[in-house]
Amino acid sequence: VPRWRQQWSGPGTTKRFPETVLARCVKYTEIHPEMRHVDCQSVWDAFKGAFISKHPCNITEEDYQPLMKLGTQTVPCNKILLWSRIKDLAHQFTQVQRDMFTLEDTLLGYLADDLTWCGEFNTSKINYQSCPDWRKDCSNNPVSVFWKTVSRRFAEAACDVVHVMLNGSRSKIFDKNSTFGSVEVHNLQPEKVQTLEAWVIHGGREDSRDLCQDPTIKELESIISKRNIQFSCKNIYRPDKFLQCVKNPEDSSCTSEI
């Protein structure tokens, strides 16, 4: 008799999920010698243990604690770059500015970025057919709880000046419902973080508006100020030039505004 399987609204687990996580872990430890001590098989076992045989709408941060412990990593707390809705540029930036880190430049973020996973209650199977959608099914699903957990820890670790890259092409440049707006903003520690500096990335070639005056940026400023953290904002009018100038700061064209 075929076993009835729960149909969720979201895509199923990424194909080759175990192999991908394990391979990413091995690669990460190779390219980050300071993490060479990490046992990737143990990391995978802890990752698997967080969601296998558990109802995929009933996952808790506690489920991920063994993985968090194995993935403990010290990044310079004053070199953290947060981002919202502009991941690719943030990753390109830290690729060039190698002393700065996004969450996805840490081991745990590198393992999971762009992957989907879930299991089933009372079976050791991974569900490759469907996984819960955050909106349509439930918020306490394996992927959402993972990112909430690692994002909270990442924000809590930040100090001094924290940078955030925001997408100026979106209707809500700052979105209270994004991971940045709902988790990271509220977990910056005022006793450690002096300033949150927003970089608003412009999309249009001829867009010379000051997007730091956008109502949603003012809302962000208000939230941050109420938490006793200073706020500053910069327009990045030409993201392509910005990246080029990070790469080659001595270039003569890099003295003007970007």
């Epitope: 080759r16 991908t20 391979a23 990413r24 690669k27 390219i31 390109q92 690729q95 970025d113 762009d114």
Partner: nanobody, 117 residues
């Protein structure tokens, strides 16, 4: 499936130079990287150098200042310029393409580099 074709190994005296080339069937993009590993007899494979999609180079401490990795995106080719070679650089050098999204390593067939007088 990424295919890799290496060239440029050989025998060289200590202090000499060699240039390895590796042509890939796919360009480096996104978070993928291309680079070189080496394995000497009886030793573990080690990462020598790799380059990112934006052309950012990274090196093992043992080769810093002597080896230079570079890429020609138009030709999907990565080069490893090896100067001031030492006997401990003797190994089989393997070109590697790391596909981040798929979590897959692709390998060339390997090319022997021997540093000896």
């Amino acid at each position: 499936q990424v295919k890799l074709q290496e060239s440029g190994g050989g025998l060289v005296q200590p202090g000499g130079s060699l240039r390895l080339s590796c042509v890939a069937s796919e360009r480096i993009f996104s978070r993928n990287t291309m680079g070189w590993y080496r394995q000497a007899p009886g030793k573990q494979r080690e990462l020598v150098a790799y380059i990112t999609s934006l052309g950012i180079a990274n090196y093992a401490d043992s080769v810093k200042g002597r080896f230079t990795i570079s890429s020609d995106n138009a030709k999907n080719t990565v080069y490893l310029q090896m100067n001031n070679l030492k006997s401990e650089d003797t190994a089989v050098y393997n070109c590697n393409y790391w596909h981040y999204a798929a979590g897959r390593d692709y390998w060339g067939q390997g090319t022997q580099v021997t540093v000896s007088s």
